[in-house]
């Protein structure tokens, strides 16, 4: 398809590595949210860290290729990793402009489908890339 995908771009302070090189940051006239136009895919992603009381965005941007899940119109996150006890990383992929701005819903921590508390543990920076 000819038109390029545009996604929300965000990287939380302290996140190791960057997906900035997967697109071209746009001047949207506002400080936030930032927008990125994808170079290598038509697919956005988002990563949220869900703890007992809140969900915090960790990363948003472009994927490096089109993969299963990229055909989704909306961001429907699924659990991917445990950066620390009591928190779970959820990721989504989707294929419409700015579809990664927010998620449609997150299952509550510990609900079916969430990795068990004995799931893989990782250092915070590593867990982001595990999730991706």
């Amino acid at each position: 398809p000819p038109n390029r995908r545009t996604c929300v771009f965000f990287e939380a302070p302290g996140v190791r590595g960057s997906t900035k090189t997967l697109g071209e940051l746009l001047d949207t006239g506002t400080e936030l949210p930032r927008a990125i136009r994808c170079l290598y895919s038509r697919c956005c992603f988002g990563i949220w860290n869900l703890t007992q009381d809140r969900a915090q965005v960790e990363m948003q941007g472009c994927r490096d290729s089109d993969e299963p899940g990229c055909e989704s119109l909306h961001c429907d996150p699924s659990p991917r990793a445990h950066p620390s006890p009591g928190s779970t990383l959820f990721t989504c992929s989707c294929g419409t402009d700015f579809c990664n701005a927010n998620y449609s819903h997150l299952p509550p921590p510990g609900s079916p489908g969430t990795p068990g508390s004995q799931g893989p543990q990782a250092a915070p920076g590593e867990s982001i890339w595990m999730a991706l």
């Epitope: 000819p2 390029r4 545009t6 746009l26 001047d27 006239g29 170079l39 290598y40 895919s41």
Partner: antibody
């Protein structure tokens, strides 16, 4: 700095496959960038042919999609162009180019390929 | 594909002249207000050299006498005071849609 150098035969027979190599120095082709092939016809028109990305994904100009393959050898820091079933209309100067964004900041010097029997 | 039309196809000018080259796209090359139009200079026997990216941004090392402007479908490359080394062919390129496409070129010759 990033440097690119094209190499390959300057003469190809009609219906055969054109094969070119681009050797990149000063930068790893797996680090970043799209690695492109662009050609310039004798009438001076420029055509973007396609790229292989740092991650190995490819994108091709639809006008060439049935005939073009771009691949790479990461151990040699090279990427390749294959264009099958060539005709005289494929006679051109072929450039490889590196792009961090969607414009072309780094170019090879170009190599002339003539298609003739 | 987006068609890029440059005008004029050639022009004659003298050192010190102000030169303007235009490029018109068959459809808008803007994404959310950002113009994906770029300009190159090519001298005989050499590869094209990037001058301007995203309509108006000067590539590092390019003299400030070169400037770009425009949005949507109509763009302009201006050389404020033509120098002897500026006699060359100039191309525009859009990257708003795949496949990337180039204009046919404008040859700037010595009057």
């Amino acid at each position: 700095q990033v440097q690119l150098q094209e190499s390959g035969p300057g003469l190809v027979k009609p219906s055969e496959t054109l094969s070119l190599t681009c050797t990149v120095s000063g930068y790893s082709i797996t680090s970043d960038f799209a690695w492109n092939w662009i050609r310039q016809f004798p009438g001076k028109g420029l055509e973007w042919m396609g790229y292989i990305s740092f991650s190995g994904s490819t994108s091709y100009n639809p006008s060439l999609k049935s005939r073009i393959t771009i691949s790479r050898d990461t151990s040699k820091n090279q990427f390749f162009l294959q264009l099958s079933s060539v005709t005289a209309e494929d006679t051109a100067v072929y450039y490889c180019a590196g792009s961090r964004y969607s414009w072309f900041a780094y170019w090879g010097q170009g190599t002339l390929v003539t298609v003739s029997s | 594909d987006i068609q890029m039309t440059q005008s004029p196809s050639s022009l004659s000018a003298s050192v010190g002249d102000r030169v303007t080259i235009t490029c018109r796209a068959s459809e808008s090359v803007d994404t959310y207000g950002n113009s994906f139009m770029h300009w190159y200079q090519q001298k005989p026997g050499k590869a094209p050299k990037l001058l301007i990216y995203r309509a108006s941004n000067l590539e590092s090392g390019v003299p400030s006498r070169f400037s770009g402007s425009g949005s949507g479908t109509d763009f302009t490359l201006t050389i404020s005071s033509l120098q002897p080394e500026d006699f060359a062919t100039y191309y525009c390129q859009q990257s708003n849609e795949d496949p990337y496409t180039f204009g046919g070129g404008t040859k700037v010759e010595i009057k």
